[in-house]
């Protein structure tokens, strides 16, 4: 039975004999981040039972994690490149505080968590170069982010584990939606 790159894979496509277009470079970059998320999810799932927990909904209510919806113009029906790109960049900017929260949440994968955070910053820069309508992109308020970070770090151990799991799961899905949408641009 075939085994493709999954949650346990580090296998990104082979080296190229010709230069990549900017879209292909972004595609490969997102794949690299997804590999990092997989490694982090592996550690999270190994050290707690959060990945099988049925109490996700309880914790999810307290998080405002970006999610792709049909109105964002990234789906095939009603696809709108400008609207979609704004949603992608805005969403990634909103995830930054959550990626900052993840920095102290890993023991054996500390470098991987840092790599995911830094690679996301680079991805945002790539995409901002691509965007025509930069004025429509809202950047989260630093003070709002700081208080959110404090609040998340003050949670009990169980909620912190659950928050870590939910951030990784949501960021993975958001990036997968991005991959699909960006391939249409």
């Amino acid at each position: 039975a075939p085994v493709l790159p999954g949650e346990d894979s580090k296998n990104v496509a082979a080296p190229h004999s010709q230069p990549l277009t900017s879209s292909e470079r972004i595609d490969k970059h997102i794949r690299y981040i997804l590999d990092g998320i997989s490694a982090l999810r592996k550690e999270t799932c190994n050290r707690s039972n959060m990945c099988e927990s049925s109490k996700e909904a309880l914790a999810e209510n307290n998080l405002n994690l970006p999610k792709m919806a049909e109105k964002d113009g990234c789906f095939q029906s009603g696809f709108n490149e400008d609207t979609c790109l704004v949603k992608i960049i805005t969403g990634l900017l909103e995830f930054e505080v959550y990626l900052e929260y993840l920095q102290n949440r890993f023991e054996s994968s500390e470098e991987q968590a840092r790599a995911v955070q830094m690679s996301t910053k680079v991805l945002i820069q790539f995409l901002q170069k691509k965007a025509k309508n930069l004025d429509a992109i809202t950047t989260p308020e630093p003070t709002t982010n700081a208080s959110l970070l404090t609040k998340l770090q003050a949670q009990n151990q169980w909620l912190q584990d659950m928050t870590t799991h939910l951030i990784l799961r949501s960021f993975k899905e958001f990036l997968q939606s991005n991959l699909r949408a960006l391939r249409q641009m």
Epitope: G6, H16, K172
Partner: antibody, heavy 122, light 107 residues
Framework: QVTLKESGPVLVKPTETLTLTCTVS??????????VGWIRQPPGKALEWLAH???????RYNSALKSRLTISKDTSKSQVVLTMTNMDPVDTATYYC??????????????WGQGTLVTVSS | EIVLTQSPATLSLSPGERATLSCRAS??????LHWYQQKPGQAPRLLIY???QSISGIPARFSGSGSGTDFTLTISSLEPEDFAVYYC?????????FGQGTKVEIK
């Protein structure tokens, strides 16, 4: 173990609507990055991608057949349904469903059903 | 629409020989090309993805190469079970398209 199984009529009359169901197991239709697609193969000919549906209900159709195709899913039943209207004898083919996607939302099919031969004849 | 042209249409070889199958894209698709094997009466089976990435469970005698517009599937030493039809697939952009296939038959 990932499996996909197609079901539907083996014979349809011209102008009728074909409804095919793909029942999957071993993975969830709601797992992010995943999807299910339909591909057909007329006897002795090459493969042709028809449509697919992603985990979040985003859909894609082959533009040449888009007006005739509808794809939907029922996650609770682990089923994906394809309907094709106004069937014609040239639509006689083996219809396959296949799993698509993965971590990188790959545009490829890694697991396939065994296929169902649909004949269009009066 | 990206058109994939496979050559030759038929390849007549003996077991133990090396098979070289070609797939050419009408425009650059980077490494977003996948190869499938199909035996009579069976569904296709994924062999190689992203031009050269191998899949666990697929024998090491199957390998892929290429990027851009020209791609090759190589079977280093044909086994009796390798005689089948091989298809390449554009995984770069819509609509997803397949080549017309190369039939590898016993000489």
């Amino acid at each position: 173990q990932v499996t996909l199984k197609e079901s539907g009529p083996v014979l349809v009359k011209p102008t009728e609507t074909l409804t095919l169901t793909c029942t999957v197991s071993g993975f969830s239709l709601s797992t992010s990055g995943m999807g299910v697609g339909w591909i057909r193969q007329p006897p002795g000919k090459a493969l042709e991608w028809l449509a697919h549906i992603w985990w979040d209900d985003d859909k894609r159709y082959n533009s040449a057949l888009k007006s005739r195709l509808t794809i939907s899913k029922d996650t609770s039943k682990s089923q994906v349904v394809l309907t094709m209207t106004n069937m014609d004898p040239v639509d006689t083919a083996t219809y396959y469903c296949a799993r698509i996607g993965g971590l990188y939302v790959d545009y490829l099919m890694d697991y396939w059903g065994q296929g169902t031969l649909v004949t269009v004849s009066s | 629409e990206i058109v994939l042209t496979q050559s030759p249409a038929t390849l007549s070889l003996s077991p133990g020989e090396r098979a070289t199958l070609s797939c050419r894209a009408s425009q650059s698709i980077s490494d977003y090309l996948h190869w499938y094997q199909q035996k009579p009466g069976q569904a296709p089976r994924l062999l190689i993805y992203y031009a050269s990435q191998s899949i666990s469970g697929i024998p090491a005698r199957f390998s892929g190469s290429g990027s851009g517009t020209d791609f090759t599937l190589t079977i280093s030493s044909l086994e009796p079970e390798d005689f089948a039809v091989y298809y390449c697939q554009n995984g770069h952009s819509f609509p997803w398209t397949f080549g017309q296939g190369t039939k590898v038959e016993i000489k």
